[in-house]
């Protein structure tokens, strides 16, 4: 009985619980189209259980798959502006190490002001993922239209 | 030690695996932004598991980071009609207790007749989340076209 | 020492950790709206782990609650095109066994070039999931625009 | 079994007013959302006006725009369409019409009409 | 605004022939397209929504076809009892607007 009871256990910290939400901090310096990151229970409701920052960038701790998200929304933008200003377009991808680089999701803005989107992908240890906004406008940093999350899912 | 080690484990009924999937019932009166959800088998698809309707708008029974998405369609919709009403916004947040009011997730439809997005969040047991649409256009009731759901991931 | 072990196994197979990301092999014949999917690690980060391909439709192996996400990019596509073109719907449904034949997510591209939602849904060992694409346009294959999965969430 | 039945009509003259009223039964009419159609003598349908299931959003065809109002009452699950500055071309039979539940769309149900007739 | 046309204006058919009525839309309105059926002093009646879906009650006789911007009522062997004027609308975006309809007669 002991036994078969033992068998529902599940020692928390094996689940491989890492998961992350970031929200923006800054866009990059000119020629650098990456958007740097920030995330921490001090700034609001973003948050690192596992993964960890490197220099705005999201480096992963555990192999598995993950959950990829995002949500970028343009600041000062209409359907006009959107259009006048195309090709703004969000791309997320592995970027260091420079081996496994790839792009895992990408998404133009055509005529809207933001983009949402999400998939699963197999993530490393060391895996570093960037998200590059290409394009003259300008992301919103409101939380709760720019933000920037993944989570793992399985081994 | 028997202890220290008991504390390691997590009965698998114990997971948390909280979740609910709503489809529309209705919109608010007049000066009320809220759309109402309603969920359970015999409406179809939708169910809640762990997570509670409390007119209309979900209640959240235990902490923890969850994964918050919604699919918003504007019926009788066309770009023309959707940027011709535009501004019509979609906002997802806690409402209640009021001491942790807050914005989660914010679209705008611009010329476009659907906002589908997704977030990780923190929520705690007792926050209710209201999903406000404001603007003149209705939500298609449509169970394919409107939902909202949430998905606990962690503690 | 057996039974200390027995306490921190769960096997991963009864997790049902089943999961299947796929990217866009091909289109159907005329007068077949589907969209054909394929996946394997030989064709970059697609795979399926648990769900199974059927003349490149998922095949579900596990009852549960799953989290089914999409994302598809028309090829060849600008605002002007995807609104000339309109209308062009995207839906994912159960097409298999008939019985339980039912639309899960649908969304239209209006002025947009790219569509992605998600929703929580309950699905049965046997279920095929179909998604149709329905309008003269053309995705893209590219599989970082394209792409389709399912993550097993709870029984 | 729905019903809709519609009172209020009648004969006035030019610019002046007139409420009509369409009381439902057989189905929750607080979660359905209704419009007004007419047609003039002897022509075709004319979309007029349509109100959301909580009255929270109304629309309205341009021909009738800031002069006609609809409202309802869902406690009396009643639908009302205040008619002022009324001119001759807006004679009719008036038919109260639901919406079907999914999409605010076409009028799965309708009523038998009331006739409105504008003339000096 | 939509503007949908209906041809014939008239139509006489035969008794158990087939009636085949057809509306235009000036641009497209996906399947959003419902038929009525208005018989002389009475209210309409809905009988196809999303351009191919028969509303409740309806006999099979009836069908609808089409999406875009051309659509088919059919039906396909007339009763005495379908002499009455049809009418389509769309419903994909407002003002919602209504063909002028069609006269069904037997011949």
């Known amino acids: 009985q002991r036994f078969a009871q033992a068998q529902q256990q599940l020692p928390l910290e094996s689940l491989g619980w890492d998961v992350a939400e970031l929200q923006l901090n800054h866009t990059g310096p000119q020629q650098d189209p990456r958007l740097y990151w920030q995330g921490g229970p001090a700034l609001g409701r973003s948050f690192l259980h596992g993964p960890e920052l490197d220099k705005g960038q999201l480096r992963i701790h555990r192999d598995g798959i993950y959950m990829v998200h995002i949500q970028v929304t343009l600041a000062i933008c209409s359907s006009t502006t959107a259009s006048r200003h195309h090709p703004t377009t969000l791309a997320v991808g592995i970027c260091s190490p420079a081996s496994r680089s790839i792009s895992l999701l990408r998404l133009s803005f055509h005529q809207g002001c933001t983009i949402a989107s999400q998939r699963l992908t197999p993530l490393a240890r060391g895996d570093t993922l960037c998200t590059n906004l290409t394009g003259t406008l300008l992301p919103s940093r409101n939380t709760d239209e720019t933000f920037f999350g993944v989570q793992w899912v399985r081994p | 030690q028997r202890f220290a080690q008991a504390q390691q484990q997590l009965p698998l009924e114990s997971l948390g695996w909280d979740v609910a999937e709503l489809q529309l019932n209705h919109t608010g009166p007049q000066q009320d932004p809220r759309l109402y959800w309603q969920g359970g088998p015999a409406l179809g698809r939708s169910f809640l598991h762990g997570p509670e309707l409390d007119k209309g708008q979900l209640r959240i029974h235990r902490d923890g980071i969850y994964m918050v998405h919604i699919q918003v369609t504007l019926a009788i919709c066309s770009s023309t009609t959707a940027s011709r009403h535009h501004p019509t916004t979609l906002a997802v947040g806690i409402c209640s207790p009021a001491s942790r009011s807050i914005s989660l997730l914010r679209l705008s439809f611009h010329q476009g007749c659907t906002i589908a997005s997704q977030r990780l969040t923190p929520l705690a047991r007792g926050d209710t989340l209201c999903t406000n649409l404001t603007g003149t256009l209705l939500p298609s009731r449509n169970t394919d076209e409107t939902f909202f759901g949430v998905q606990w991931v962690r503690p | 020492q057996r039974f200390a072990q027995a306490q921190q196994q769960l096997p991963l197979e009864s997790l049902g950790w089943d999961v299947a990301e796929l990217q866009l092999n091909h289109t159907g014949p005329q007068q077949d709206p589907r969209l054909y999917w394929q996946g394997g690690p030989a064709l970059g980060r697609s795979f399926l782990h648990g769900p199974e391909l059927d003349k490149g439709q998922l095949r579900i192996h596990r009852d549960g609650i799953y989290m089914v996400h999409i994302q598809v990019t028309l090829a060849i596509c600008s605002s002007t095109t995807a609104s000339r073109h309109h209308p062009t719907t995207l839906a994912v449904g159960i097409c298999s066994p008939a019985s339980r034949s039912i639309s899960l997510l649908r969304l239209s591209f209006h002025q947009g070039c790219t569509i992605a939602s998600q929703r929580l849904t309950p699905l049965a060992r046997g279920d095929t999931l179909c998604t149709n694409l329905t309008g003269t346009l053309l995705p893209s294959r590219n599989t970082d625009e394209t792409f389709f999965g399912v993550q097993w969430v709870r029984p | 079994e729905v019903q809709l039945l519609e009172s209020g009509g009648g004969l006035v003259q030019p610019g002046g007013s007139l409420r009509l009223s369409c009381a439902a039964s057989?189905?929750?009419?607080?979660?359905?959302?209704m419009s007004w159609v007419r047609q003039a003598p002897g022509k075709g349908l004319e979309w007029v006006s349509t109100i959301s299931d909580s009255g929270g959003s109304t629309f309205y065809a341009d021909s009738v725009m800031g002069r006609f109002t609809i409202s309802r009452d869902n406690s009396k699950n009643t639908l009302y369409l205040q008619m002022n500055s009324l001119r001759a071309e807006d004679t009719a039979v008036y038919y109260c019409?639901?919406?079907?539940?999914?999409?605010?769309?076409?009028?799965?149900?309708w009523g038998q009409g009331t006739l409105v007739t504008v003339s000096s | 605004e939509i503007v949908l046309t209906q041809s014939p204006a008239t139509l006489s058919v035969s008794p158990g022939e087939r009636a085949t009525l057809s509306c235009r839309a000036s641009?497209?309105?996906?399947?959003?397209l419902a038929w009525y059926q208005q018989k002389p002093g009475q209210a309409p009646r809905l009988l196809i929504y999303?351009?191919?879906s028969r509303a409740t009650g309806i006999p099979d006789r009836f069908s609808g076809s089409g999406s875009g911007t051309d659509f088919t009522l059919t039906i396909s062997s007339l009763q005495a009892e379908d002499v009455a004027v049809y009418y389509c609308?769309?419903?994909?975006?407002?003002?919602?607007?209504f063909g002028p309809g069609t006269k069904v007669e037997i011949k």
């Open positions: 609308q769309q419903y994909y975006s407002t003002p919602f607007t």
């Open positions: 999303g351009a191919s």
């Open positions: 057989g189905f929750t009419f607080s979660t359905y959302a």
């Open positions: 019409a639901r919406h079907d539940y999914s999409n605010y769309a076409f009028f799965d149900y």
């Open positions: 641009q497209s309105v996906s399947s959003n």
